[in-house]
């Protein structure tokens, strides 16, 4: 059955980020995950990040150099933004950004969170807090071992998500992430918005940016 | 309830100096960025740099060392300040920020 | 710096049809776009935000979609008041840049 996974907070205060280990999903087909740029709280300095879906070996040196593939970037203090990334078996045109079972995906920011870091290419909270989240798609949570894991890139959307259409398994080598320090995102139903939508919040806003 | 008000002159010589002040009201400027557009008669948007919450400033480089923005947060004022101007700068300029913008102030530069 | 286009540059349509305008980003921008609408004499107005999130008090009607480079504004049933020109804007990096506009006109 499809789920909307536990949404995941784009925070250096999240603690699934604080443990110092990467953050570990597991998604099915049909599964929605919200990527959440939280909007800024009173006394708190606002958060400046750029979330890129990498290649497994961007996300082991903490490097968005090399053709990086931008998702969504959190610059708008007034209000919350919400990425939503869909995980569908088909891709609804050529554009589409195709996830294929049983492999490893990756997603983090080479930001360090201040406004003049943002465009930060190398590093950033990707090396300082492992805020990284890394997607195992159709994969088992009990059953799986890095030798199992072969990885790919996908190619870019052009929809309001990520829609990400799997399909059978390539054989690119056995890149998945072999550290074994990952937080892991149970699987439960949320309620909530599971929006469609790249992104929503309140108040909505246009402006807050750089 | 969030609101922004721009003021400054209609006209302006050629060469000289634009100063609009936007004053703002509802929010803090230390949460929202404030940001400056403009439209020449009849054509669209553009946008020329914004003031982010922290204090920093960014600017769009087609308006090279020309253009400086400031604020004085106890007064809730940002500040454009556009020297040489020429012709071409005759536009509308608005400040905004996430869903409201100011009703603009009509600038002519005239020789 | 970010050129985005939009197209076609103006269009006629009839009370309740339906039209779709087009912004498409020099590179790649993730979600980080906005349209806005703009009527005659006034100052622009947040549609869609994020892309494809409907401002509040923003009508169904109105409908954002895309990412990476290919964006849309759709807009369903159109309303006599929804005469104006309407703006594409990316503001992922610096310099944040507008489309140059859409004009919508009503037979």
């Known amino acids: 059955l499809a789920k909307n996974l536990e949404p995941v907070s784009w925070s250096s205060l999240n603690p699934k980020f604080l443990s110092g280990k990467g953050l570990v999903i597991y998604p099915k087909i049909g599964d929605k995950l919200d990527i959440i740029c939280p909007r800024a709280e009173a006394g708190r300095p606002y958060e400046y990040y750029k979330l890129y879906l990498v290649r497994p070996e961007q996300a082991a040196a903490c490097s968005t150099v090399l053709d990086p593939n931008v998702l969504v970037t959190c610059n708008r203090p007034e209000q919350e933004i919400r990425f939503t990334i869909k995980f569908q078996e088909f891709s609804p045109n050529y554009m589409g950004l195709e996830f294929k079972k049983h492999h490893d995906y990756y997603i983090t920011s080479t930001s360090n969170g201040s406004l003049e870091g943002l465009e930060n290419r190398e590093g950033g909270v990707c090396r300082t807090r492992t805020m990284k989240i890394i997607m195992k798609v159709g994969q088992d949570p009990n059953a799986v071992t890095p030798e199992q894991l072969t990885t790919s890139r996908p190619s870019k959307e052009a929809d309001n998500t990520v829609k990400m259409a799997t399909q059978a398994p390539g054989s690119r080598g056995s890149l998945g992430d072999s550290d074994g320090k990952h937080e892991t995102v149970n699987q439960e139903e949320k309620s909530g918005p599971g929006a469609s939508g790249g992104s929503s919040g309140d108040p909505d806003g246009f402006f807050n940016s750089k | 309830q969030v609101q922004l008000k721009e003021t400054g002159p209609d006209l302006v010589h050629l060469t000289q100096t634009l100063s609009i002040t936007c004053t703002v009201s509802?929010?803090?400027?230390?949460?929202?960025?404030i940001h400056w557009v403009r439209q020449p008669p009849g054509k669209g948007l553009e946008w020329m740099g914004a003031m982010w919450n922290g204090g920093g400033t960014d600017y769009n480089s087609a308006f090279k060392s020309r253009l400086s923005i400031s604020r004085d947060t106890s007064k809730s004022q940002v500040f454009l300040k556009m020297n040489s101007l020429q012709t071409d700068d005759t536009a509308k300029y608005f400040c905004?920020?996430?869903?409201?913008w100011g009703q603009g102030v009509m600038v002519t530069v005239s020789s | 710096e970010t050129v985005m286009t939009q197209s076609p540059t103006s269009m006629s349509t009839s009370i309740g049809e339906r039209v779709t305008l087009n912004c498409k980003a020099s590179q790649s921008v993730g979600i980080n776009v906005d349209w806005y609408q703009q009527t005659p004499g006034q100052s622009p107005k947040l549609l869609i935000y994020?892309?494809?999130s409907r401002h509040t008090g923003v009508p169904d009607r109105f409908t954002g979609s895309g990412f990476g480079r290919d964006f849309t504004l759709t807009i369903t049933n159109v309303e006599a008041e929804d005469l104006a020109v309407y703006y594409c804007?990316?503001?992922?990096?610096?310099?944040?840049?507008f489309g140059s506009g859409t004009r919508l006109e009503i037979k």
């Open positions: 994020g892309a494809s």
């Open positions: 509802g929010f803090s400027l230390t949460t929202y960025n």
């Open positions: 905004a920020t996430p869903t409201d």
């Open positions: 804007l990316h503001y992922g990096s610096i310099p944040f840049t």
